[in-house]
């Protein structure tokens, strides 16, 4: 199978997940594909602790995460429930702003310079964070 027992080379391990922090920019879909080629996904933030960990690594730079509403409701790329899950939007966000003049609204979420989230045009070339979970079976205690 494709289950992982250790992180890919140059990825950062944290709390049984592996993270890749880019230093270049891509559109949201292209960043997502970069992650998927490693059988990973754009980062899914499920707790304040994970938010702080990611924020520490990316610094004050706009960075894509695995959250979008391109098909209507907001969805996490790994199926994590959005409505009941962790959220860290900036005040008055998301706003699906149309005033940018690029056509359409804003359907993809990113970390802003202070770590809080904003929705923006998915074609903007922002940095990105990939995440992949380590083999859950390896978390089981050994049989005695």
């Amino acid at each position: 199978g494709s289950e992982r027992t250790c992180c890919p080379v140059n990825w950062v391990e944290h709390e049984r997940s592996c993270y890749w922090f880019s230093r270049s920019g891509k559109a949201w879909a292209d960043a997502d594909n970069y992650c998927r080629l490693e059988d990973a996904h754009l980062v899914v933030v499920t707790s304040w602790e994970e938010q702080k960990f990611v924020q520490h690594h990316i610094g004050p730079v706009n960075t894509w995460m695995g959250l979008h509403d391109q098909n209507g409701p907001w969805k996490w790329v790994d199926g994590t429930d959005y409505e009941t899950g962790f959220k860290n939007w900036r005040p008055e966000q998301p706003d699906d702003w149309y005033g940018h003049g690029l056509g359409g609204g804003e359907d993809c979420a990113h970390f802003t310079d202070d770590g809080r989230w904003n929705d923006d045009v998915c074609q903007r070339p922002y940095r990105w964070v990939c995440e992949t979970e380590l083999d859950k079976a390896s978390q089981e205690p050994p049989l005695l």
Partner: antibody, heavy 121, light 107 residues
Framework: EVQLLESGGGLVQPGGSLRLSCAAS????????MSWVRQAPGKGLEWVSA????????YYADSVKGRFTISRDNSKNTLYLQMNSLRAEDTAVYYC??????????????WGQGTMVTVSS | DIQMTQSPSSLSASVGDRVTITCRAS??????LNWYQQKPGKAPKLLIF???SLQSGIPSRFSGSGSGTDFTLTISSLQPEDFATYYC?????????FGQGTKVEIK
């Protein structure tokens, strides 16, 4: 030595099928996404398909979508391309290529020698 | 899809010449641009990745530059073994696409 070796090419009639294989050696095959790239006689290079490290995600050029299927067997260090409903315009040398990763950047850093597929009646 | 356009499609040059090949993308690809060399009957070989980074084992007479939509491959002093076809390729977005190639021939 890092090496990719394709096989399975040949002459096939339009509408027929063929399965290409690519045997990898000299590197940790399961750590790299892989691709197929083709080159029609006297023409340029065309990316055909890609597959993620563990095989969970696949990508296709529009020209082959629905007809070709990429797969891999990491236990055998082998990449495959199942080609169905073949057309004359699929005639080409087919190369398998390793996706080298250089930080955020990627490129086809290792190529096989290619296998010729001819679709003709 | 991102279209890649190379120019010229062919050129004639002599050993020792400085050769420049250009590649233009239909939209910005920042520096997600690779260059390959292909000799007749052989597989392509990676020369340059990330627009300007020299692949291991490639002679330093090869160099790449550019960002956004316009890129250049330069061979500072053409050697006999450099007569080949050169391709650019964008790795910004799937489907990955190649330029149509530039054939470097002996004058």
């Amino acid at each position: 030595e890092v090496q990719l070796l394709e096989s399975g090419g040949g002459l096939v009639q339009p509408g027929g099928s063929l399965r290409l294989s690519c045997a990898a050696s000299g590197f940790t095959f399961s750590s790299y996404a892989m691709s197929w790239v083709r080159q029609a006689p006297g023409k340029g290079l065309e990316w055909v398909s890609a597959i993620s490290t563990g095989g969970g995600n696949t990508y296709y050029a529009d020209s082959v979508k629905g007809r070709f299927t990429i797969s891999r067997d990491n236990s055998k260090n082998t990449l495959y391309l199942q080609m169905n409903s073949l057309r004359a315009e699929d005639t080409a040398v087919y190369y398998c290529a390793k996706r080298g990763v250089y930080g955020d950047f990627d490129a086809f850093d290792i190529w096989g020698q290619g296998t010729m597929v001819t679709v003709s009646s | 899809d991102i279209q890649m356009t190379q120019s010229p499609s062919s050129l004639s040059a002599s050993v020792g010449d400085r050769v420049t090949i250009t590649c233009r993308a239909s939209q910005s690809i920042t520096n997600f641009l690779n260059w390959y060399q292909q000799k007749p009957g052989k597989a392509p070989k990676l020369l340059i990745f990330a627009a300007s980074s020299l692949q291991s084992g490639i002679p330093s007479r090869f160099s790449g530059s550019g960002s956004g939509t316009d890129f250049t491959l330069t061979i500072s002093s053409l050697q006999p073994e450099d007569f080949a076809t050169y391709y650019c390729q964008q790795s910004y977005s799937i489907p990955w696409t190649f330029g149509q190639g530039t054939k470097v021939e002996i004058k």
